[in-house]
């Protein structure tokens, strides 16, 4: 279909427009352009005949038009009167007519606008301001911007006069902003320079800072006054009603109790003529005493005693505060405060309650802290630890054992060998030991303050021969591709080398195998079924060596995708169908069958005697391993043909 596209549709005065023809028929006699929406000889602009290549101007030709061979019409130096419709009339070579109409609009280029205002210094909550965008231009859209944002929605903002006038009713200080107007038409847009609205306001009620009204004798009093105001306010200070000075700040050094009283700041705005005052009452106090903490139990026993801490001195109408470890009191059922907060009780103290503790007295002007107090909580002894952890020693070496038990006050230690007291020391030392030094070594820890004792026994074996080691495991039935297993070679022996074998071979190099703890521990990461082997550990020193019994790792795996046998899928009618399903799995999986989606028996073998074509369908074997929690399945299609209908069919079992 013949169409006309105006490029551009909206044309600026003085510019040009192209009436571009689309889908012009191929074989043409000629074409003609008309001003208006129809073919009218009196409004013909120009005609063009293909055969003669002759362009003939019409009555509406202005000399600004150029016609192109593709029938498009260029109009130059556009004037306002060019706005409207244009019709192209095409005569095809068979003298059949076609016509299409296009249009464009002409707009003037806009000048840069400016803003005029009816009030350059409006007063807050009193005046209105009307901004007008100049000049008035026909067919132009007027827009307004406040701080480069579009106008906010507000009942105090009103647009009128075709949006050319913006009125702000009852101006506020928040209307102090940058205002711009913009004129737009389809061919141009221009913004004015910004106009800053200067709203006179205030003064608001002044604010006196700092806010504290209580001071200590001897401090400096430095008060500052501020009131929001435009232009800035002028300030005056009054003490107990008597004028002091006309400054924004009031400074009195080294105040005394006599400086207590009412302090008034007055703010004045000379443009609005308004005054506002604020009064603050200042109290000057003499120096209060420093607090301290007393305790009802200086050496409480862990899990037995309670402790009451009291903040001294007792002062009426005083707020008491507490801190533990430089933090405010934690919430705990073991911490209790008295009604006046002066006494802090710790119920059933623990070794972690040592502190430090501080109390504070709060008065009108500050908080005074006590010195910190630390609680001496008696505890222990805990079960002693004997080090080193070796249990096997070679003859001729020195035996040096150390014992430690957490305790306050520190524990007193005693050593016993096979029940006989040896010495009252924390360390036991025997040089050049022999097999006779084998036995039970006991460490006893005693807390004299609490009267509690605790013991630990260790078996020491002195032998030239190393014992036969054994393997302990942290996971007896790991799952394939999921679990890790750590084997540890027991016992821990001094000056001993630990070795490992897998299936009688030394350890293979593998990123999944890791030795640690002086080679005493072998870790297998992400076990696989191939890790189900015999593991042996060995210990050796310069005089002997020994190997453990093998430990076989039982890796749980599967079930893998099952296999149905025999592989045949075509059977003759009358044959027996005997299908067997197998899946690699540890432990062995549970088997079940489905025929055409219908559950059958829970067996590894499916047997159907004398099958017929009715037994056609899908045979699915399902396997599940309860230990690994995994399932698998396979589907096989079985076709049963009537006897003798198709070659190559299995006769069945």
């Amino acid at each position: 279909k013949l169409t006309i596209e105006s490029t551009p549709f909206n044309v600026a005065e003085g510019k040009e427009v192209l009436l571009l023809v689309h889908n012009l028929p191929q074989h043409l006699f000629g074409y003609s352009w008309y001003k208006g929406e129809r073919v009218d000889g009196n409004r013909q602009i120009i005609g063009y005949v293909i055969g003669t290549q002759q362009a003939t101007p019409g009555p509406a030709y202005s000399g600004r038009e150029i016609i192109y061979p593709n029938a498009s019409l260029l109009i130059q130096n556009i004037i306002q009167n060019d706005t409207g419709f244009y019709t192209l009339h095409v005569i095809k070579s068979d003298l059949v007519n076609e016509e299409a109409t296009g249009q464009f609009r002409v707009y003037p280029e806009l000048p840069k606008p400016s803003i005029s205002s009816n009030n350059s210094k409006p007063v807050e909550d009193k005046d209105a301001v009307a901004f007008t965008c100049e000049p008035e231009t026909q067919d132009a859209t007027y827009l307004w911007w406040v701080n480069n944002q579009s106008l906010p929605v507000s009942p105090r903002l009103q647009l009128s006069n075709g949006n050319r006038t913006l009125t702000l009713f009852n101006v506020t200080r928040n209307d102090t902003a940058s205002y711009k107007c913009e004129t737009q038409n389809p061919v141009s847009a221009r913004r004015s320079d910004s106009v800053i609205l200067n709203v006179l306001y205030g003064p608001d009620a002044p604010t006196i800072s700092p806010l504290n009204t209580s001071y200590r004798s001897g401090e400096n009093l430095n008060l500052s006054c501020h009131a929001a105001s435009n232009p800035p306010a002028q300030y005056s200070w009054f003490v107990n009603g008597t004028f002091q000075q006309s400054t924004q700040e009031l400074f009195i050094p080294n105040i005394t109790v006599n400086n207590s009283g009412s302090y008034t700041c007055q703010a004045h705005n000379s443009d609005t003529g308004l005054n506002r005052t604020t009064v603050t009452t200042i109290t000057v106090y003499a120096e209060p005493p420093k607090p301290f903490i007393t305790s009802n139990n200086s050496n409480p026993v862990e899990d037995e005693d309670a402790v009451a801490l009291t903040c001294e001195p007792e002062i009426q109408n005083t707020t008491y505060l507490w801190w533990v470890n430089n933090q405010s009191l934690p919430v705990s059922p073991r911490l209790q405060l008295s009604n006046d907060n002066r006494t802090l009780t710790l119920l059933s103290v623990t070794r972690n309650d040592v502190g430090p503790y501080e109390c504070g007295i709060q008065n009108e002007l500050s908080v005074d802290h006590s010195d910190p107090v630390i609680l001496n909580v008696l505890y222990g002894p805990d079960d002693p630890t004997i080090s080193p952890s070796y249990t096997y020693y070679r003859p001729g070496v020195n035996l040096s054992l150390s014992c430690h038990a957490a305790s306050n006050p520190p524990a007193q230690y005693s050593w016993l060998i096979d029940g006989n007291i040896q010495q009252h020391t924390q360390e036991l030392f025997i040089s050049n030991i022999t097999e006779k030094n084998s036995g039970l070594y006991t460490c006893q820890a005693n807390n004299s303050a609490s009267g509690h004792s605790r013991t630990t026994v260790k078996t020491i074996t002195v032998s030239a021969e190393l014992p036969k080691p054994s393997i302990s495991s942290n996971n007896s039935k790991p799952v394939e591709d999921k679990d890790a297993v750590a084997f540890t070679c027991e016992p821990e022996a001094q000056n001993t080398t630990y070795l490992w074998w897998v299936n009688g071979q030394s350890l293979p190099v593998s990123p999944r195998l890791q030795l640690s703890n002086g080679n005493r521990t072998l870790t297998l990461f992400n076990v696989t079924r191939n890790d189900a082997r015999a593991y042996v550990c060995g210990i050796q020193n310069s005089v002997s060596a020994n190997r453990s019994d093998p430990v076989t790792l039982d890796v749980l795996y599967g079930p893998d995708t099952p296999i149905i046998s025999p592989p045949d899928s075509s059977y003759l009618s009358g044959a027996n169908l005997n299908l067997s399903c197998h899946s690699a799995s540890n432990p062995s999986p549970q088997y079940s069958w489905r025929i055409n989606g219908i559950p059958q028996q829970h067996t590894q073998v499916l047997f159907i005697a004398k099958i017929t074509p009715n037994n056609n369908g899908t045979y699915a074997c399902f396997v599940s391993n309860l230990a690994t929690g995994r399932n698998n399945s396979i589907v096989k299609s079985i076709t049963v043909s009537a006897s003798g209908t198709s070659p190559g069919l299995s006769a069945g079992a």
Partner: antibody, heavy 121, light 106 residues
Framework: EVQLLESGGGLVQPGGSLRLSCAAS????????MGWVRQAPGKGLEWVSS????????SYADSVKGRFTISRDNSKNTLYLQMNSLRAEDTAVYYC??????????????WGQGTLVTVSS | DIQMTQSPSSLSASVGDRVTITCRAS??????LNWYQQKPGKAPKLLIY???SLQSGVPSRFSGSGSGTDFTLTISSLQPEDFATYYC????????FGQGTKLEIK
């Protein structure tokens, strides 16, 4: 001065053939579209056919389509109408006419005086 | 095909009269309408093309108007030489004529 002169009319039996000619002068024939219009005795005008300046474009009224052929010889400034399978209703005065060089929309600005074709047994 | 209907078929008028002949198309033909005058024994003569454009050399008492389906030929002041038969022709496809209007002296 534009002149169009038709010839070749006469009496012909039904089913017979006739060839009309139109000699043109006074304008650039080779760049002008041409046409034939007929008028049965005592009846109105009926457009018959038209042809483009280069002969490649031809149009016919449904009543003559397949029987009449319009053609031109620009070297002789002559327009033709070959009429075959003539019928009694083809009896009319046949006018040769010119479409002007600024033809918006198509119209016939010069006509010949016509030639009479009578189809009768 | 587009049918053209002229009315009236015949018309009697006197010299100096204003005469109007109408032509109606069976479907819209935009401004593609021409008017012709034919005197007895003569070839037709073009008066108006494109519904309202006066052919060169035709007196200005002849005027045409209309678009779409309804068109009018007006003779503002009838002259003795104007008595003839008038045909409208649509310039669409095919270029069919109206049946004619015979203008006679009253």
């Amino acid at each position: 001065e534009v002149q169009l002169l038709e010839s070749g009319g006469g009496l012909v039996q039904p089913g017979g053939s006739l060839r009309l000619s139109c000699a043109a002068s006074g304008f650039t024939f080779s760049s002008s579209y041409m046409g034939w219009v007929r008028q049965a005795p005592g009846k109105g005008l009926e457009w018959v056919s038209s042809i483009g300046s280069g002969s490649y474009s031809t149009s016919y009224a449904d009543s003559v389509k397949g029987r009449f052929t319009i053609s031109r010889d620009n070297s002789k400034n002559t327009l033709y109408l070959q009429m075959n399978s003539l019928r009694a209703e083809d009896t009319a005065v046949y006018y040769c006419a010119r479409y002007p060089s600024v033809p918006f929309p198509p119209h016939l600005d010069y006509w010949g005086q016509g030639t009479l074709v009578t189809v009768s047994s | 095909d587009i049918q053209m209907t002229q009315s009236p078929s015949s018309l009697s008028a006197s010299v100096g009269d204003r005469v109007t002949i109408t032509c109606r198309a069976s479907q819209s033909i935009s401004s593609y309408l021409n008017w012709y005058q034919q005197k007895p024994g003569k070839a037709p003569k073009l008066l108006i093309y494109a519904a309202s454009s006066l052919q060169s050399g035709v007196p200005s008492r002849f005027s045409g108007s209309g678009s779409g389906t309804d068109f009018t030929l007006t003779i503002s002041s009838l002259q003795p030489e104007d008595f003839a038969t008038y045909y409208c022709q649509q310039a669409g496809n095919p270029h069919t004529f109206g049946q004619g209007t015979k203008l006679e002296i009253k």
